[in-house]
């Protein structure tokens, strides 16, 4: 008998408004997997330590993934 | 204006089923999650149940697990709650309530309420 | 499901300070947040996160968290601040919601 599979992703609502990169104290990225069938982006905010799920799919979204992953390289020697 | 409006409440007989609606109106709906809450007479809040922004989510409490169904339909900006199987200690004052939108799930805009009694 | 823990009972002389706590595992890794509901009516809420008011929540109302504990404070109590209050987070699963049993304030 196959296992059944339970769906759980952690993110049960979305921003999509721009978020500042200064402000921000961690970025995951959570792939898409067998537990959860869509990419999640939770953002830990510097001010209070509290996290907010972003949408991959908002353009002020990506824009902030791209501003993060330059600012990422530019460290790395 | 910011506001969910219920609908649905009534008096139904033990092993009968009930669906109930929660509109909304003055934000983007598809963007957040959605709860149900209810109260028994003279009792604290109890958590029911969750959907997730898109509806591929859901979640229960285990007391409704197998008996009730949370859905929501974005495109008429309303959230549901099939209740089949009811029982006597289901009767409550139920609310919809607005996913805050942070981490932490918590209800920052609730319905008026509306009241279920289940009896024969 | 993992529970948290109210005094049932608080009371407060008008004017003074109050502070409502809540215990629980679960707020090791979720912040709490706080409701207030007065007979025959919804509940509100007053704080979330990391001592969030909504708008239209007087600044007397204010919440921190340590360890397992939130608290909620209302700093100068007014006799509209009598009401029950509930405290609520995300619980040790991360899936389900736990409410506390409720803390019936009286102001004196």
């Known amino acids: 008998v196959p296992l059944s599979r339970t769906v759980r992703c952690t993110c049960i609502s979305i921003s999509n408004q721009p978020v500042n990169p200064r402000s921000l104290e961690k970025l995951e990225i959570i792939p898409a997997s067998q537990f959860c069938p869509r990419v999640e982006i939770i953002a830990t905010m510097k001010k209070k330590g509290e996290k907010r799920c972003l949408n991959p799919e908002s353009k002020a979204i990506k824009n902030l993934l791209k501003a993060v992953s330059k600012e990422r390289s530019k460290r790395s020697p | 204006e910011v506001q969910l409006v219920q609908s649905g409440g009534g008096v139904v007989q033990p092993g009968r089923s009930l669906r109930l609606s929660c509109a909304a109106s003055?934000?983007?709906?598809?963007?957040?999650?959605m709860h149900w809450v209810r109260q028994a007479p003279g009792k604290g809040l109890e958590w029911v149940a969750v959907i997730s922004y898109d509806g591929s989510n859901k979640y229960y409490a285990d007391s409704v697990k197998g008996r009730f169904t949370i859905s929501r339909d974005n495109s008429k900006n309303t959230l549901y709650l099939q209740m089949n199987s009811l029982r006597a200690e289901d009767t409550a004052v139920y609310y919809c309530?607005?996913?805050?939108?942070?981490?932490?799930?918590?209800?920052?805009?609730w319905g008026r309420g509306t009241l279920v009694t289940v009896s024969s | 499901s993992s529970e948290l823990t109210q005094d049932p009972d608080v009371s407060v002389a008008l004017g003074q300070t109050v502070r409502i706590t809540c215990q629980g595992d679960s707020l090791t890794s979720y912040y709490a947040s706080w409701y207030q509901q007065k007979p025959g009516q919804a509940p509100v809420l007053v704080i979330s996160g990391n001592d969030n008011r909504p708008s239209g929540i007087p600044d007397r109302f204010s919440g921190s968290n340590s360890g397992n504990t939130a608290s909620l404070t209302i700093t100068g109590a007014q006799a509209e601040d009598a009401a029950d209050y509930y405290c609520g987070s995300r619980d040790s699963s991360g899936y389900q919601v736990v409410f506390g049993a409720g803390t019936k304030l009286t102001v004196l």
């Open positions: 003055g934000f983007t709906f598809s963007s957040y999650g």
């Open positions: 309530a607005k996913d805050g939108g942070w981490y932490d799930w918590y209800f920052d805009l």
